[in-house]
Amino acid sequence: WKFMGSKCSNSGIECDSSGTCINPSNWCDGVSHCPGGEDENRCVRLYGPNFILQVYSSQRKSWHPVCQDDWNENYGRAACRDMGYKNNFYSSQGIVDDSGSTSFMKLNTSAGNVDIYKKLYHSDACSSKAVVSLRCIACGVNLNSSRQSRIVGGESALPGAWPWQVSLHVQNVHVCGGSIITPEWIVTAAHCVEKPLNNPWHWTAFAGILRQSFMFYGAGYQVEKVISHPNYDSKTKNNDIALMKLQKPLTFNDLVKPVCLPNPGMMLQPEQLCWISGWGATEEKGKTSEVLNAAKVLLIETQRCNSRYVYDNLITPAMICAGFLQGNVDSCQGDSGGPLVTSKNNIWWLIGDTSWGSGCAKAYRPGVYGNVMVFTDWIYRQMRADG
C-alpha cells in the first residue's frame, strides 16, 4: 500500500519487488499481481490514535473501518498477524464509536468459515454503531514521565519513564540509542549501522537499565539481524532508519516496554510537545553520559526548518525537525537512533529516530529526526517477511 512517495501516477500503486505499477482495483483483490505478492499482503491497517482497524477495498479503491458486528478476537489476531505482529503480542480488541463513518466493511456471517478478507463486504450501515479498534501489542505505556530534564546540560530520566529506550553497544561501548517496538524488534538509525557495523554480531542491546556502568556482559541482548533502509543516503541522511532483530525476545516489565508506531491519520502539529532521550553527550564534543537523560522539545514545521536561516532545504519528507530555534535543548552525539516521542490519548508514539544536526543545541540548528510515519509500512514489511 505504497501510496506515499510512489513512482506511479495517482491512480497506480507500486510493487516493491519489481517497481511496476498496478491498478488500485487489483490491490487486495485476492489475486497476486506483484511478483512478490505484496499487493495481497497489506490489506489491513490501523488508523489514527484510536487504532481503528481499516481494510482496503479494491472495489472502492479506498480504506474503510470494520464494523464491530459479529467480529471476534480471532479475526483481530489474524489482522494483527497480517500486519507483521506475532500472536503472542496481541493485546486486545476494543470498540470505538463509529463517529460519523458512512461506509464500512462488515462480516458476512452467511459466507461460511472462509478467510477473513473473503468474509468482508461493503455496507453503508453498522447496526452496533461501533467500529473495531485493535491493539496488536500493548505499547506506549510508561510509568510517570520524567521530570523536566535535558540531554544537553540536564537532569537524568526516572526509572520506567522511557521504557522503550535501549542502549546499543559495540564492544562494550555505547554507540547509539534505539526504541523497542516489539519484544524482538528495535528501531534505530541507519547511520548507526553503516559498514562495517552492519554485521549483527557487533551489536548488543541493553533495555531497562538507566546507567551505562550497569550494562555489563550477560545483561544484554545479542542482535540477530540488522536491516538498514534500502534508500538510506549516507551523505544527506535521507531515510535514516534501521531495524535490529534480537536473537532472544525481551521480557516486558515496568522498565522494559514497547513504544507505539504511529498510525496513518495521526496529524502532527507544529510546536507539538515531544520528548527525546538518550545517553548522548551532554555538551557538544562531550563524552557519552553515564545516565539516561531526556528533554522536552517542540516540533518545528518542515517549511520553517528548510528556511535559509535554518537548514536551507536539506530537510526531506523523510525527516522531522524538533527542538528550539533559540538552541539550549537538543540531542547530541551518542543519542543517534534513539526516540523522539509524543503523547496522544495517553499513549506514547514513536514519531522520530534521532538522525543528525549541526552541532548540539545551537541556535537555528535544531535536531533532525527520521520521520517514522513515512517508514511504518517498511517496518511492518520487514516484520512480516521475517515471519
Partner: antibody
C-alpha cells in the same frame, strides 16, 4: 461436494516425527484456512492450530509451539501437519478441518497416530 | 484460556423425547459458538454455528440458543440416528471445545 481426505494410520516410536496429509477437494482451496484437531482415545477434542492457505500465516496452540508445523501445497490442494519429538501421549486420532478463524466444517475422516516403543 | 463446560456428561433419553444439552463458557464468547455431533469411529459434523444457525442439511429438530456464557442445544424429538456424543466449540478467542455430552438410549 466438499471433501477432506487424510493419509493412513501411522505407528511411530517415541522421539520420532509424523507427517499427516489432508487432501482438499470440491472448493476453492485458497479461500479457506485449515485447522488441525486431535482426539486421544476416549477423550475430547483438542485444538492444535491452523493455517491460512491464503497467506500462509499459522497459529499454534501454546502446548504444541516449537514441536508442530502446519503447511499447505496449493498446487495439490493438500495441507500437512508435522509433529516432532513424539511421546506416548501423542497417541490420538488427528483430524484436519476446513476453516481457521471461526468454526470448522467439514472435517477429514481422521488419521490414527500410535506412538509406542 | 476460555473453559467450556458441558452438562450433563451423559443424557439418557427415549426415542421421540426431547433432549436439552447445556454448554457454559468461563467468560463471554458472545454468539461465537458451534455444536458438533460425533458418532463412534467418525469425525465430528457441524450442527449449529453462531449459537443458533443450523448448518446446511441439518434437520429442524436441532436448535441452538443462548449468547454470552450460557448456551443450549435442543433436539426436539430424538431419532435413532441422533444417539451420539455432542461437543460445543467456542471460537471467540482462540478455540476450545467442551468435554462432550453423550446422548444414549434410555
Amino acid at each position: 461436494q466438499v471433501q477432506l481426505v487424510q493419509s493412513g494410520a501411522e505407528v511411530k516410536k517415541p522421539g520420532a516425527s509424523v507427517r499427516v496429509s489432508c487432501k482438499a477437494s470440491g472448493y476453492t482451496f485458497t479461500n479457506y484456512g485449515i485447522t488441525w484437531v486431535r482426539q486421544a482415545p476416549g477423550q475430547g477434542l483438542e485444538w492444535m492450530g491452523g493455517i491460512s492457505v491464503y497467506n500462509g500465516n499459522t497459529e499454534y496452540a501454546e502446548k504444541f509451539q516449537g514441536r508442530v508445523s502446519m503447511t499447505t501445497d496449493t498446487s495439490t490442494t493438500t495441507a500437512y501437519l508435522e509433529l516432532r519429538s513424539l511421546k506416548s501421549d501423542d497417541t490420538a486420532v488427528y483430524f484436519c478441518a476446513r476453516g481457521q478463524l471461526d468454526y470448522f466444517d467439514p472435517w477429514g475422516q481422521g488419521t490414527l497416530v500410535t506412538v509406542s516403543s | 484460556e476460555i473453559v467450556m463446560t458441558q452438562s450433563p456428561a451423559t443424557l439418557s433419553v427415549s426415542p421421540g423425547e426431547r433432549a436439552t444439552l447445556s454448554c457454559r463458557a468461563s467468560q463471554s464468547v458472545r454468539s461465537n459458538l458451534a455444536w458438533y455431533q460425533q458418532k463412534p469411529g467418525q469425525a465430528p459434523s457441524l450442527l449449529i454455528y453462531g449459537a443458533s444457525t443450523r448448518a446446511t442439511g441439518i434437520p429442524a429438530r436441532f436448535s441452538g440458543s443462548g449468547s454470552g456464557t450460557e448456551f443450549t442445544l435442543t433436539i426436539s424429538s430424538l431419532q435413532s440416528e441422533d444417539f451420539a456424543v455432542y461437543f460445543c466449540l467456542q471460537y471467540n478467542n482462540w478455540w476450545t471445545f467442551g468435554q462432550g455430552t453423550k446422548v444414549e438410549i434410555k
